[in-house]
């Protein structure tokens, strides 16, 4: 449905002098009153005009009036200096009514034909104003047939008078500690008929300070105090103002955390208004003095409510509140002028007593028991039997509270057992089974399970043995009774070890030959290394050069001796390596199945027999001396041989350890 009044009936028509187009009579007076609908005006023009000309049109005339105003008095045919004829002019009513009066006097010197005029109602464009006139609307004017309406820009609302735009300037709340506020449109003239309210609301403890800046221009009166437009400032303590005129008001220190600013304007005037810059202050907190070995940040001239500072300690010092360490420290100034937390201390970092090093010791370098920042300690391993793995053992107490090595490691160094040490200098000469002396075979391990077997100690928590020797216990590792550090099989004086897990080579098939006859036992605890318990070395890549045909290896164990009984004392035998083809051929004939000797085996013994390992020796190490490192290494594991140990033309067969180095290393590193 269209807005505005009901569509009006058309208003238009014709007017003419009496008798037109003939001459008009004397002493005539005719009056027409034309009315247009509200919001419309009347337009009138003449198509014919012929009246007697007289000075100031005193005799005959047509008078056009709109309300009380005479629009024109017309006579003659053409305008003169003092008289006006309509010519082609168009006349408009000022409002919606137009009065037309025609008068003729008592005589005419000659005949005159009078006038003809046409009129019509047309819409008034109220939005069009003459220069110098006040605009119809404050902001936007919208004309329509029969009327107009005003609208306002965003942030304003149309006043009840339907023309003025009042500013929507109430309810603004300022909560920052400083800011600016001004009259609407500043520095352009402020709006009329507006009532603005601004609130500054800070946390309790703050005090607002108001400064009028730049310019101040609010409509005033010479005698009465701010009767038209005014600015008032209200706090919970007092009221300031009203303010008007052109003088900047003085600074106002409100001593309050809440301020309400009211600005009221009337319907007239053209003034630029005001601008306020506000700040705040509060009761300052005591100046923070940094603790020794610390500093304050940020550094300020003063600290007031909500201001904060942090304490940072110098490298090597840590924050302590009382006796408790702090990760960080920040204090905030409160409304009563006190800090919310007491000042902490910066205390020298203490790394604490260093951890004990298994199989090693620690020495305080800086001073006895000194464990504070930059203190130095020295770890070392127990001489002879342990060596430190890739580390110089020097640790420094660093700022993070950790003992740290020169390589930046925080973990302890590792004392690795020295391998391959023996009281024996060399084998060299071939001779029969001999009794071992203390320290000759410190890697020798006695394994008691279902049967008697042997093994060799690797590192300080692994035993290398033959798969067939521990196969029955692979799922019951704890059933293995592992003994070391003794020469006598039945002696009560030995070091006891227990198995945590048994790892049998996945290529070993029980009761189907002896290929891949190798196993590892993980001990549940590390053993202490000494002259009687020392691990055997694993072969280096270059070890094959010490294991050629006729090179001497040494086998040791408590297995069957020539007398057919298990040895009471650890025995050993020095035996040469046998050519692989020769050994393969020796086991080609019955009762041995073809292919008994594989590339994963090596053979050792005398062609004439008499020197061999035997039942009970299984799993023990066949060792060789690495003349370059002067360490003994395991080349073979006692695996199998002829039915009759030491038989002529037959040889002892050993698992070739060098083929299994990756397997051994993988198991040990994974577990």
């Amino acid at each position: 449905t269209p807005l505005g009044p009901k569509w009006p009936e058309p208003v238009f028509g014709r007017l003419a002098s009496p008798g037109f187009p003939g001459e008009y009579a004397n002493d005539q007076e005719r009056r027409w009153t034309l009315t247009a609908p509200p919001g419309y005006r009347l337009r009138l023009y003449f198509t014919h005009f012929d009246l007697e000309l007289s000075h100031l049109c005193e005799y005959d005339f047509v008078k056009l009036s709109s309300g009380a105003k005479v629009l024109a008095t017309l006579c003659g045919q053409e305008s003169t200096d003092t008289e006006r004829a309509p010519g082609k002019d168009t006349f408009y009513s000022l409002g919606s009514s137009l009065d037309i009066t025609f008068r003729s006097d008592y005589s005419n010197e000659k005949p005159f034909t009078g006038f003809e005029a046409f009129y019509a109602a047309e819409d008034i464009d109220e939005c069009q104003v003459a220069p110098g006139e006040a605009p119809t609307c404050d902001h936007h004017c919208h004309n329509h047939l029969g009327g107009f309406y005003c609208s306002c820009r965003a942030g304003y609302v149309l006043h009840r008078n339907k023309r003025t735009c009042s500013a929507l300037c109430s309810g603004q709340v300022f909560t920052q500690r400083s800011g600016e506020l001004s009259s609407p449109e500043y520095p352009r003239p402020y709006p009329k008929l507006s009532s603005c309210t601004y609130s500054i609301s800070l946390e309790e403890g703050f005090s607002v300070i108001l400064d009028f800046v730049e310019s101040f221009d609010v409509e005033t009166h010479p005698e009465t105090l701010c009767p038209y437009d005014f600015l008032k400032i209200q706090t919970d303590r007092e009221e300031h103002g009203p303010f008007c005129g052109k003088t900047l008001p003085h600074r106002i220190e409100t001593k309050s955390n809440t301020v309400t600013i009211t600005f009221v304007t009337d319907e007239s005037g053209d003034h630029t208004g005001w601008k306020i810059h506000y700040t705040s202050t509060a009761q300052p907190c005591p100046y923070p003095m940094a603790p020794p070995n610390g500093h304050v940040s940020p550094v300020q001239a003063k600290y007031i409510l909500k201001d904060s500072f942090s304490i940072f300690c110098e490298t090597g010092y840590e924050l302590l509140q009382g006796h408790l360490p702090l990760k960080s420290f920040t204090a905030v100034c409160q409304k009563d002028g006190s800090w919310d937390r007491p000042m902490p201390a910066c205390s020298i970092v203490d790394c604490g007593p260093p951890d004990d090093l298994p199989s090693g010791r620690v020495e305080y370098i800086t001073g006895p028991g000194v464990t504070t920042y930059k203190a130095v300690i020295q770890y070392s391993c127990e001489e002879t039997f342990y060596t430190m793995k890739v580390n110089d053992g020097k640790y420094v107490c660093e700022a993070d509270g950790f003992w740290t090595s020169s390589k930046g490691e925080k973990s302890l160094p590792v004392c690795e057992p020295v391998c391959g040490l023996s009281a024996r200098t060399t084998g060299g000469r071939i001779y029969g089974g001999q009794k071992a002396k203390p320290g000759d075979f410190p890697w020798q391990v006695l394994i008691l399970g279902g049967t008697t077997a042997a093994g060799a100690l690797l590192y300080d928590n692994w035993v290398l043995t033959a798969a067939h020797a521990v196969y029955e216990q692979k799922h019951d590792a704890s059933a293995l009774d592992i003994r070391m550090g003794t020469l006598k099989r039945l002696s009560p004086h030995y070091t006891q070890a227990w198995s945590e897990a048994v790892f049998i080579h996945e290529g070993y098939t029980h009761d189907a030959g002896f290929d891949n006859d190798i196993a590892l036992i993980k001990l549940n605890n590390k053993v202490v290394i000494n002259s009687n318990i020392t691990p055997i070395c694993l072969p280096r890549k270059e070890a094959e050069s010490f294991m050629r045909t006729d090179d001497i290896g040494t086998a040791s164990g408590w297995g069957l001796t020539q007398r057919g009984f298990l040895a009471r004392n650890l025995m050993y035998v020095d035996i040469p390596i046998v050519d692989h083809q020769k050994c393969t051929a020796a086991y080609e004939k019955p009762p041995y199945p073809r292919g008994s000797v594989t590339a994963n085996m090596l053979c050792a013994g005398l062609e004439s027999g008499g020197k061999d390992s035997c039942r009970g020796d299984a799993g023990g190490a066949l060792v060789f001396l690495d003349s370059e490192t002067e360490r003994w290494f395991v080349g073979g594991i006692v695996s199998w041989g002829s039915m009759n140990c030491g038989e002529a033309g037959q040889y002892g067969v050993y698992t070739k350890v060098i083929n299994y180095i990756p397997w051994i290393e993988n198991i040990i590193s994974d577990f």
């Epitope: 302590l320 009382g322 006796h323 408790l324 360490p325 702090l326 990760k327 960080s328 205390s347 509270g401």
Partner: antibody, heavy 118, light 107 residues
Framework: QVTLKESGPVLVKPTETLTLTCTVS??????????VSWIRQPPGKALEWLAH???????SYRTSLKSRLTISKDTSKNQVVLTMTNMDPVDTATYYC??????????WGQGTLVTVSS | QPVLTQPPSVSVSPGQTASITCSGD??????AYWYQQKPGHSPVLVIY???KRPSGIPGRFSGSNSGNTATLTISGTQAMDEADYYC?????????FGTGTKVTVLA
């Protein structure tokens, strides 16, 4: 060798006051940045800190129990005493004393079970 | 009293890594401490000041703390690590313990 040992009644009646004593050895209650804390653990529940006292005599209490707790130390006897007034069956718990060093509670007593029942 | 929230339980296979979280408002701004408690025993400090290990605590225990969460990590978990674990932090000068997490090492 650092040790702490709690002693006190095994059974307390409701409304009564509990007094627990912690006797320490292996460290000093008067020197160093050390403190002693009391912690309790109701059966089958989590640990609950109660109070602590440092060598400087600085004390602190659990907010919700502040009005009922008092901690003190007797340096000459190497003892820390905790009293807890107006005992209630919900206070039934194992009460531990423990040493504080560098913010960590690094040595604990074996604990004493206190039952509150009429 | 502020609240430190832990998952009630965590299960892990032997040799695998167990992670226990402890959540609290701005916990990363404070130091976190971790305790292990086995049934019938007193708690044992395993990590102090977020990531430091006391003497005698195995290297498989490690800690971290940032944002709102502290984490205790047990790498290569062993059967003997089955226990209740509690986090703890200091709020001003009062100690706050976590709700506790039961770590189960699967057979």
């Amino acid at each position: 060798q650092v040790t702490l040992k709690e002693s006190g009644p095994v059974l307390v009646k409701p409304t009564e006051t509990l007094t627990l004593t912690c006797t320490v050895s292996g460290f000093s209650l008067s020197r160093g940045k050390m403190g002693v804390s009391w912690i309790r653990q109701p059966p089958g529940k989590a640990l609950e800190w109660l109070a602590h006292i440092f060598s400087s005599d600085e004390k602190s209490y659990r907010t919700s129990l502040k009005s009922r707790l008092t901690i003190s130390k007797d340096t000459s006897k190497n003892q820390v005493v905790l009293t807890m007034t107006n005992m209630d069956p919900v206070d039934t718990a194992t009460y531990y004393c423990a040493r504080i060093r560098r913010g960590g509670i690094d040595y604990w007593g074996q604990g004493t079970l206190v039952t509150v029942s009429s | 009293q502020p609240v430190l929230t832990q998952p009630p339980s965590v299960s892990v296979s032997p040799g695998q890594t167990a992670s226990i979280t402890c959540s609290g408002d701005k916990l990363g701004d404070k130091f976190a401490y971790w305790y292990q408690q086995k049934p019938g025993h007193s708690p044992v400090l395993v990590i102090y000041q977020d990531n430091k290990r006391p003497s005698g605590i195995p290297g498989r225990f490690s800690g971290s703390n940032s944002g709102n969460t502290a984490t205790l990590t047990i790498s290569g978990t062993q059967a003997m690590d089955e226990a209740d674990y509690y986090c703890q932090a200091w709020d001003s000068s009062t100690a706050v313990f976590g709700t506790g997490t039961k770590v189960t090492v699967l057979a």
